[in-house]
């Protein structure tokens, strides 16, 4: 019988008392085969973290700073359930730390030196740890003691709770630095008042502070937010302009064998019976013998944290950077205006080899990081382990939802001004063998299908989106008799046709021979009835252009396209017979890396791009003998995006809507995790 006990960790007598009450009340409402509570008392949150890591306890609720400690080795805990605030319809699990300024003050984030600052309090998250952590490497050396470095960075401050004797500049704007509401500039509202009164130039608060203190929109319009990319935005655009997105209060558990499903089952049932306005005799979100015991009194309920989400992703790159800077106190030696090497994310073994050769030739400009799937690469870019990669439009969508931005687009047509002219896109097509003359778009049911990979544009999002509109369900593996769609569940019929050996079967990388455009076409040639690829795939792999044994004798004339009106056309007539226009692949990165990635990639393509004529004797960035490694092999150049510099603008309204419609069929664990952070 599986042990269905969750050992909750309590950090005080009062918490232990509430925990016992929680245990007893849960016993009375949950059947004997359901989850139960046991209580473990420890002296501190850090002791609780250690106890959970050592399997002496299972769960505890922590503030963001402690979630970071819990994630660090050797603890390796992960967030499993989040408290939410506000309403069930619009649950708030995060707040945003922001830098507020007056509209006419005219400076940016990188010009804060010498300004006057207003803080909620020394050591507090939004008011101190996050802004000072992010500014840490700009502080004058020596950076220890930190208060002295901050005092020398700003021309004057109000940082309540600071030592006014040792660091008088930190109390210059609020004499005495009082650590309570007796100090008019203490806390969120106080820090904002410090700005409003004209004492300071910038206030470090949370996004709701402005709304709580200024009910009138006209008054709010006198203020702006400083963004990390050295721009400003209106105060209601805090989701796109903040210092960090911070989780409010989170239940953590072990990463391995952590009982996360059981913890959720317990808490979900607990909120049903003892949540807000549910029961008189025991209330989960109430602390008669104290404040915020086990859970925050202001919480309204719980939400399950998506399983793909580790602590780094949950806390977010900015927050982790800020806290790591404060804790570790290390800064790069290079001046910050110089670009560090770009860490390119390579998918599995084959891309890594090409990336390595690029790295050797780039003379220190490119480093390589490996991951097994595109989603793992996106996650690495999000958390700073990698910086950039080129993605199919379907993954540009996921990366965009995860906060990454497109920076350059692959262009596939030769033109005089290639780098300045991003193209409209390529065509997604359905290819069949000419010999299967009865096959049309309208009778694909029961046929064998070949896809580039799940989540990619031409191979999945476009054809499956069109199919979904027809069949109104997501069971594509029942629609086709079998197929190869790398990235599908291994036991799915859409992995049956794949050719990878052992663990590589159906993997969404080049270890699966039927992965990508060339792979999907190979799948059609060898086993399938229809392949969903791009309009250039057939000509690129026929007529001897692909020397591989399976392709060297193929003839373009032996293949045809399926048109949406039920007719068929020759391959060269793709302009009048395609499923949709697809956005070109694009390079994505984090916002903070955008300028450097742009600069370094433009240098790299001038050295190793299409201008290199002999790829047998030179490194060529856009060649890998039909394998599309790192970039599509038909890339002519990487083009500037001009104003199409967000994922929505880049992909276009129509495509974003199409992928959005297919979201209900999504198996992307990363997309689920990212939409949890930003619904």
């Amino acid at each position: 019988v599986p042990d269905k006990t969750v050992r909750w960790c309590a950090v005080s007598e009062h918490e232990a008392t509430k925990c016992q009450s929680f245990r007893d009340h849960m016993k009375s409402v949950i059947p004997s085969d359901g989850p139960s509570v046991a209580c473990v008392k420890k002296a501190s949150y850090l002791d609780c973290i250690r106890a959970i890591a050592a399997n002496e306890a299972d769960a505890v609720t922590l503030d963001a700073g402690l979630v970071y400690d819990a994630y660090l080795a050797p603890n390796n805990l992960k967030p499993v359930v989040a408290e939410f605030y506000g309403s069930k319809e619009d649950p708030q699990t995060f707040y945003y730390a922001v830098a507020v300024v007056k509209k006419d003050s005219g400076f940016q984030m990188n010009q804060l030196r010498g300004k006057k600052s207003c803080h909620t309090g020394l050591g507090r998250s939004a008011g101190w740890n996050i802004p000072i952590g992010l500014l840490y490497c700009d502080l004058p050396e020596p950076r220890k003691p930190l208060e002295k470095a901050v005092a020398n960075f700003f021309s004057g401050s109000c940082a309540p709770c600071a030592d006014g004797t040792d660091f008088p500049q930190l109390c210059q704007l609020c004499p005495g630095c009082g650590c309570s509401t007796l100090n008019q500039y203490f806390g969120y509202s106080g820090a904002f008042k410090c700005l409003k009164d004209g004492a300071g130039d910038v206030a470090f608060v949370k996004h709701s502070t402005i709304f709580e203190n200024l009910a009138n929109k006209a008054d709010r319009d006198q203020y702006e937010l400083l963004c990390l990319d050295n721009t400003r935005k209106p105060v209601d655009e805090y989701k796109d302009c903040h210092l960090a997105q911070v989780p409010s209060h989170t239940v953590v558990a072990r990463s391995m064998g952590g009982k996360e499903d059981l913890i959720w089952e317990l808490l979900n049932q607990a909120q049903e019976h003892f949540g807000k306005d549910k029961s008189k005799e025991f209330q989960l979100f109430s602390s008669p013998h104290g404040k915020d015991l086990l859970f925050k009194d202001s919480a309204h309920g719980f939400l399950k944290v998506p399983p793909r989400m580790d602590a780094k992703m949950y806390l977010g790159y900015e927050y982790v950077t800020a806290i790591r800077n404060l804790r570790e106190g290390t800064c790069p030696e290079a001046p910050t205006d110089e670009c560090k090497p770009v860490k390119w994310c390579a998918l599995s073994h084959h891309e890594r080899l090409k990336c390595d050769e690029w790295s050797v030739n780039s003379v220190g400009k490119i480093e390589c990081v490996s991951a097994e799937t595109t989603e793992d690469c996106i996650a690495k870019i999000m958390n700073g382990e990698a910086d950039a990669m080129s993605l199919d439009g379907g993954f540009v969508y996921i990366a965009g939802k995860c906060g990454l931005v497109p920076v350059l687009a692959e262009n596939y047509n030769k033109s005089d001004n290639c780098e300045d002219t991003p193209e409209a896109g390529y065509f997604a097509i359905a290819v069949v063998k000419k010999s299967a003359s009865d096959l049309t778009w309208d009778n694909l049911k029961g046929k064998k299908s070949c896809h580039t990979a799940v989540g990619r544009t031409a191979g999945w999002n476009i054809p499956m989106g069109l199919l979904y509109n027809k069949i109104n369900h997501c069971r594509f593996d029942e629609f086709f008799s079998e197929g190869c769609a790398p990235g599908s569940k291994k036991d799915s019929s859409l992995c049956k046709l794949c050719m990878g050996s052992g663990l590589n079967l159906c993997e969404p990388n080049n270890k699966e021979g039927y992965y990508g455009y060339t792979g999907a076409f190979r799948c059609l040639v060898e086993k399938g009835d229809v392949a969903f690829v791009k309009h250039q795939t057939v000509p690129q792999n026929t007529g001897g252009k692909n020397p591989d044994p399976w392709a060297k004798n193929l003839n373009e004339k032996d293949y045809e396209l399926l048109c949406l009106d039920g007719t068929r056309k020759p391959v060269e007539e793709y302009a009048n017979c395609h499923l949709a226009r697809a956005p070109n692949h694009a390079v994505v990165t984090r916002k903070d890396k955008e300028a450097c990635v742009h600069k370094i990639l433009r240098q790299q393509q001038h050295l190793f791009g299409s201008n290199v004529t002999d790829c047998s004797g030179n490194f060529c960035l856009f060649r890998s003998e039909t394998k599309d490694l790192l970039f599509r092999d038909d890339t002519v150049c990487l083009a500037k995006l001009h104003d199409r510099n967000t994922y929505e603008k880049y992909l276009g309204e129509e495509y974003v809507k199409a992928v959005g419609n297919l979201r209900k069929c999504s198996t992307s664990s990363l997309l689920e995790a990212c939409t949890f952070r930003r619904p």
Epitope: L353, K354, N510
Partner: nanobody
Framework: EVQLVESGGGLVQPGGSLRLSCAAS????????MAWYRQAPGKGLELVAG???????KYADSVKGRFTISRDNSKNTLYLQMNSLRAEDTAVYYC???????????WGQGTLVTVSS
């Protein structure tokens, strides 16, 4: 296609030195990039050092300052001078000229380096 054969491996004590050679069956003068990789037991392949035709080099962080890659185009040979060897340098070492354009699943037999006291 040029064939590459690695040699020079062996058993050496920590702190010792070895020089690996990679002999090519044809001219390497026109080869853009050559590199040494290694595979430790139970681990994946990792780039140890690479060199371009023009002589620019790159090293893995773990070997910087200890290993030196060089090529002698007149002898059609790639070298890896390994000094201050450590136990964690134990691996099979392979050379590549990237001529199979990255998707080679074929590597030579390699040369085994064992660092142990």
């Amino acid at each position: 296609e040029v064939q590459l054969v690695e040699s020079g491996g062996g058993l050496v004590q920590p702190g010792g030195s070895l020089r690996l050679s990679c002999a090519a069956s044809g001219s390497i003068a026109s080869i853009a990039t050559m590199a040494w990789y290694r595979q430790a037991p139970g681990k994946g392949l990792e780039l140890v050092a690479g060199i371009t035709r023009g002589g620019s080099t790159k090293y893995a962080d773990s070997v910087k300052g200890r290993f030196t890659i060089s090529r002698d185009n007149s002898k059609n040979t790639l070298y890896l001078q390994m000094n201050s060897l450590r136990a964690e340098d134990t691996a099979v070492y392979y050379c590549t000229d990237y001529s199979r354009k990255y998707y080679q699943d074929y590597w030579g037999q390699g040369t085994l380096v064992t660092v142990s006291s």
